[in-house]
């Protein structure tokens, strides 16, 4: 469930602190409820960037688990189509710390509406 996704995000945050990854990531910091699935997709795609750049087994495994969890939760809700949402590339680029904070916020949005 989404609580496990948050604990994975916390774990990624802890793992990243011991590294120096300077990447900036497309970040949706003001998610509209009607675009939350699209925003989630962008967050997950950018997480893969973190995984790739870190080259770290623990980060890789945690990112993969997080994506598996999110996929399964969202697929159980059926196909959700959203329109008029921003493309990932249109989002503001932010550092990893801000990116992860915004990610936690969107997950909390899913928790509050489930």
């Amino acid at each position: 469930n989404w609580v496990n996704v948050i604990s994975d995000l916390k774990k990624i945050e802890d793992l990243i602190q011991s590294m120096h990854i300077d990447a900036t990531l497309y970040t949706e910091s003001d998610v509209h409820p009607s675009c939350k699935v699209t925003a989630m997709k962008c967050f997950l795609l950018e997480l893969q960037v973190i995984s790739h750049e870190s080259g770290d087994t623990d980060i890789h495994d945690t990112v993969e688990n997080l994506i598996i969890l999110a996929n399964n939760i969202l697929s159980s809700n059926g196909n959700i189509t959203e329109s008029g949402c921003k493309e990932c590339e249109e989002l503001e680029e932010k550092n990893i710390k801000e990116f992860l904070q915004s990610f936690v916020h969107i997950v909390q949005m899913f928790i509050n509406t489930s």
Epitope: Q48, T57, D58, D61, E64, I67, N72
Partner: antibody, heavy 122, light 112 residues
Framework: EVQLVESGGGLVQPGGSLRLSCAAS????????MSWVRQAPGKGLEWVAT????????YYPDSVKGRFTISRDNSKNTLYLQMNSLRAEDTAVYYC???????????????WGQGTLVTVSS | DVVMTQSPLSLPVTLGQPASISCRSS???????????LEWYQQRPGQSPRLLIY???NRFSGVPDRFSGSGSGTDFTLKISRVEAEDVGVYYC?????????FGQGTKLEIK
């Protein structure tokens, strides 16, 4: 050439336990997730379990969840499947398979062992 | 759970002729990141399964180019352009977009 060699199969009574092993060689074991897949006699393939590269994350179908445990020892290049509370329907050839994960180009079980037969019968 | 349904279950083919196997999923297997994790495996008689195709249409190394994969969403196809004797066996589609990962029932290809 990538090699995966399963062992530990055999005859076991219903309710009994068995531990399968899969010895990996000719690749960096810790760089890959691993899976177990089984095949009942004359039947199709069934996914049984997957474990992440570091071993922290495991995944199972409901048919084995709570009874089977996948684990690994990266220092020994070995994958395990602990099978408890075995049932007649668990009778199958058990294959271990190397799993390519998405960050490295998509999911797939790209190399398989020869399998080990588990027979659950009284 | 995602149910994978293959057809036909038995496929008699003349050597040198094309063959086609269909695989349908009970729901879309496009994951949230836009990837479709659909593979095809071949199991020759008495042998272990072997990876042919991954991510719908990518041929695994060493797989002859007479094998091709296509499809999207819920409908997928494995095609063999000209069947050879060594192609005899059972072919399985498999989805690992969503846990639990699931195989199709298998299609047995035999020579007429």
């Amino acid at each position: 050439e990538v090699q995966l060699v399963e062992s530990g199969g055999g005859l076991v009574q219903p309710g009994g336990s068995l531990r399968l092993s899969c010895a990996a060689s000719e690749f960096t074991f810790s760089n890959y997730a691993m899976s177990w897949v089984r095949q009942a006699p004359g039947k199709g393939l069934e996914w049984v379990a997957t474990i992440s590269r570091g071993g922290d994350y495991t995944y199972y179908p409901d048919s084995v969840k709570g009874r089977f445990t996948i684990s690994r020892d990266n220092s020994k290049n070995t994958l395990y499947l602990q099978m408890n509370s075995l049932r007649a329907e668990d009778t199958a050839v058990y294959y271990c398979a190397r799993r390519v994960s998405m960050i490295t180009g998509g999911y797939a079980m790209d190399y398989w062992g020869q399998g080990t037969l588990v027979t659950v019968s009284s | 759970d995602v149910v994978m349904t293959q057809s036909p279950l038995s496929l008699p083919v003349t050597l040198g002729q094309p063959a086609s196997i269909s695989c349908r999923s009970s729901q879309s297997i496009v994951d949230i990141t836009g990837n479709t994790y659909l593979e095809w495996y071949q199991q020759r008689p008495g042998q272990s399964p072997r990876l042919l195709i991954y991510k719908v249409f990518n041929r695994f190394s060493g797989v002859p180019d007479r094998f091709s994969g296509s499809g999207s969403g819920t409908d997928f196809t494995l095609k063999i352009s000209r069947v050879e004797a060594e192609d005899v066996g059972v072919y399985y589609c498999f989805q690992d977009s969503f846990v639990p990962y699931t195989f199709g029932q298998g299609t047995k290809l035999e020579i007429k």
